[in-house]
């Protein structure tokens, strides 16, 4: 049978001779050279050679365990004379013994990591890993220990795991953001003579909201003309925040000051500025300077940093309102005046008042816009604003006069303003009532006494406060011996009635009745109107057949058939 132990061979042999591996030996070998040893398998005849007589095996080349740790070969022993095997072909192993010839190598040449600023000591940052190609099962050649070469006192590394942690309290991004840490991995458990490799870890502190906004100045001053309409931007303020991104976002608000209602602040997210704008119309004459307290605050706060103080800052904004030469201002937006229609020329109706609102209080002159009073019915005292008539009025022609008065600064004619005047002409009883229409009626020859032949109505251009009250009567010259009577109905109408039985159209074909109509106002106005009554022949139904004069076309009045 074969007689050998497992073969071991030290890697990376540097001697000048071949490296002795071991001896193949059969117990059948008497040492007389009758046996021949043959080697086959991994590297046989090349890497490994055998003395066919003695069975001694040698390695011809320098071997690297990390390239190939085990070689599997086959051994044969044959009788030289017969060529027959004296031992069964057998497999054997040459195991390459490790030496510490490889340094640890990190999985990355450069690591990149982030950790929030102000993190607690011991906060995980990143884990680095180094591998060693040497045999981990034998000795400490592959036992890697990590240490920090650069980056203390800020960071530490766990020697066995390669976990990098923060090592210093209150690391402030605003003070320093980037750190370059160098980590060493050393084999042999870190002992002397161990091989080592290094890697660089670039660590960036990420931002947390640990800084409040701060105004670079405590007071800002802006100017704006009093004429600035609402929405006009007056100026911009900007607080700075040492943080970045969301943590540096700022919102502005007006928290106090007498300008609280007069101004707005709008946060512009693009620039993180506060834009002060006009909110309500300003008036230099009322208030020349406003003071606002403006606050800048972080909308995103981290509760754990609230102990550092409020995440807000205040500044005072002083707004100076600049005077603008303004036109005169009337005491009213519109004036309503009244005057009787019987007013004499140069009668004063009323007055308007306008003042220069500016501090200068420039004197004002008044005038009527003639485009609104083409007939020059009215005039104005340029000095005191009194309105008076320059022509006679007639309410029945025009009830309302709408005119415009202009107030102009004497020292600066460009500054003027206008106001509407509505002048109502009040009624005076200066018109007599008159018939509502021309009355021409007829009476049948066979008419009976007290028969209604016509109803009269009157109109009056006047407009008395308590309404019209007309009275009707026959004119005195016709009252006695008249063939007709007037019956006043007391409702502003009257009726003409026959006074006798029967009329003869051959005796009298036409009657002219003078009717007096009076109103009941002061002074009383009256007029006389004439009613023409024709006598006609009628049928037995009372329908007119013929009259002495030409036939009546569409006669007014009531049928006399009744």
């Amino acid at each position: 049978s074969w007689m050998w132990n497992q073969f071991f061979l030290l890697e990376e042999y540097t001697g000048s001779d071949y490296q002795y591996v071991g001896k193949l030996h059969s117990d059948q070998d008497r040492g007389d050279g009758s046996l021949k040893y043959i080697l086959s398998g991994d590297g046989a005849g090349d890497l490994f050679i055998i003395n066919e007589n003695t069975g001694d095996i040698q390695a011809t080349k320098r071997l690297d365990r990390e390239e190939k740790p085990v070689y599997i070969l086959r051994a044969q022993a044959i009788n030289r004379r017969t060529g027959r095997p004296v031992e069964p072909e057998s497999e054997f192993i040459i195991k390459i013994h490790d030496i510490n010839d490889n340094e640890p190598i990190f999985t990355k040449e450069v690591y990149t990591a982030t950790v929030p600023e102000m993190s607690d000591v011991g906060t995980f940052v990143v884990q680095v890993t180094a591998t060693d190609a040497d045999d981990p099962t034998y000795g400490n050649s592959a036992k890697v220990v990590y240490s920090i070469l650069q980056g203390q006192p800020y960071f530490s590394v766990e020697s066995e795991t390669g976990i990098i942690k923060t090592a210093l309290l209150n690391m402030d991004r605003e003070n320093r953001e980037q750190y370059q840490v160098v980590i060493q991995a050393k084999d042999m458990g870190g002992q002397m003579g161990g091989l080592s490799g290094t890697t660089t870890v670039n660590i960036t502190l990420t931002d947390v909201n640990d800084n409040p906004p701060r105004f670079p100045q405590s007071t800002y001053q802006f100017k704006t003309p009093e004429s600035s309409p609402p929405g006009t931007p007056i100026g911009r303020i900007k607080a700075s925040d040492a943080d970045v991104g969301e943590n540096a976002e700022i919102e502005y608000s007006i928290t106090d000051g007498e300008g609280l209602d007069m101004f707005d602040v709008i946060t512009d997210q693009e620039t993180q500025e506060g834009i002060i704008t006009v909110k309500k119309l300003l008036d230099f004459e009322k208030k020349k300077v406003y003071t606002l307290k403006v606050e800048a605050s972080n909308p995103h706060v981290e509760p754990r940093f609230l102990y550092l103080g409020p995440f807000k800052d205040s500044a005072t904004v002083r707004i100076v309102v600049e005077d603008v030469d303004e036109p005169p201002v009337f005491s009213k937006l519109a004036y309503i005046l009244q005057i009787r229609e019987d007013a004499q020329i140069n009668t004063t109706i009323g007055s308007v008042t306008a003042q220069d609102p500016d501090a200068a209080r420039n004197p004002v002159k008044y005038s009527v816009d003639r485009h609104t009073d083409m007939d020059r019915i009215f005039n104005i005292d340029s000095g005191n604003g009194s309105i008076f008539t320059s022509k006679l009025l007639d309410r029945e022609t025009l009830l309302w006069h709408n005119i415009t008065v202009i107030a102009t600064e004497i020292n600066n004619p460009k500054q003027s303003s206008r106001v509407p005047l509505y002048i109502k002409v009040l009624d005076v009883n200066d018109n007599a009532p008159e018939f509502a229409e021309f009355y021409e009626t007829f009476v049948c020859e066979k008419a009976k006494a007290d028969q209604l032949i016509q109803t009269l109505r009157a109109v009056d251009k006047d407009d008395p406060y308590s309404g019209h009250q007309f009275s009707f009567s026959l004119a005195p010259e016709a009252a006695s011996g008249s063939n007709f009577t007037i019956q006043d109905n007391k409702d502003n109408t009257a009726g003409i009635l026959t006074r006798k039985n029967g009329y003869n159209r051959h005796e009298m074909s036409t009657y002219l009745l003078p009717v007096v109509i009076s109103d009941n106002d002061y002074p009383v106005q009256s007029s006389t109107g004439t009613v023409t009554v024709r006598v006609c022949a009628c049928d037995h139904h009372g329908n007119m057949q013929s009259c002495h004069a030409e036939a009546l076309i569409h006669p007014t009045g009531l049928s006399t058939g009744a």
Epitope: S228, P229, P230, G231, T232, P233, R236, E246, E249, E251, D264, I266, D268, Q269, E270, T271, I275, T277, V278, P299
Partner: antibody, heavy 118, light 109 residues
């Protein structure tokens, strides 16, 4: 980095509808006012409308030519701006841009083409 | 609402100063902004708050605003400045955003 990307453009018949989207990234979308601006072929920029941030009431404003037909909305949880376009007319043909800003438009998308044609 | 009027085109030789105006009623009491747009691209803000320049915008771009006119000035104009320029105003109250009609800047040569 800060980015706006429009999508949803295409060919649509007059009277039809289309919904454009604008995906925002790289900034706190919810805090910003967002606008839609369009540009007809060979013409100038025309403002379409805006939606303010929720902090400013989420108010929408529109240009006269699109009022009553277009609706702007936002989904802050998805960082997305929308433009719903109804009753489309041929004169609505344009490249539609979404843009960020209040006083000025500092960030613009690349635009999406909407063609309204029969 | 305010109407903003721009000249349709402005030409300038390389190295010279180009001025583009934007007229509008009392625009000086509002904030004016300017956008640059090159063919096939989205607009880019070049001036905001009348005269502020965003980061990345060359110093040759400047702005002013007073009275009824806002002005964009490009000093030492370069070929790459050839583009359309639009003004826009903001007044804090107006609910609508208004753009000018745009000005085509041509750099000669």
């Amino acid at each position: 980095q800060v980015q706006l990307v429009e999508s949803g453009g295409g060919l649509v018949k007059p009277g039809g509808s289309l919904r454009l989207s604008c995906a925002a990234s790289g900034f706190t979308f919810s805090r910003y006012w967002m606008d839609w601006v369009r540009q007809a072929p060979g013409k100038g920029l025309e403002w379409v409308g805006r939606i303010k941030s929720k902090a400013n009431g989420g108010i929408t404003d529109y240009a006269a030519p699109v009022k009553g037909r277009f609706t702007i909305s936002r989904d802050d949880s998805k960082n997305t701006l929308y433009l719903q376009m109804n009753s489309l007319k041929t004169e609505d043909t344009a490249v539609y841009y979404c843009a960020r800003g209040m006083t000025f438009l500092g960030i613009w998308g690349q635009g999406t083409l909407v063609t309204v044609s029969s | 609402d305010i109407e903003l009027t721009q000249p349709p085109s402005v030409s300038v030789s390389p190295g010279q100063t180009a001025s583009i105006t934007c007229s509008g009623d009392s625009i000086g009491s509002k904030y004016a902004q300017w956008y640059q747009q090159k063919p096939g691209q989205a607009p880019v803000l070049v001036i905001y708050y009348n005269s502020e320049r965003p980061s990345g915008i060359p110093e040759r771009f400047s702005g002013s605003n007073s009275g009824n006119t806002a002005t964009l000035t490009i000093s030492g104009t370069q070929a790459e400045d050839e583009a359309d320029y639009y003004c826009q105003s903001w007044d804090g109250q107006s609910t609508i955003r208004v753009f000018g009609g745009g000005t085509k800047l041509t750099v000669l040569g």
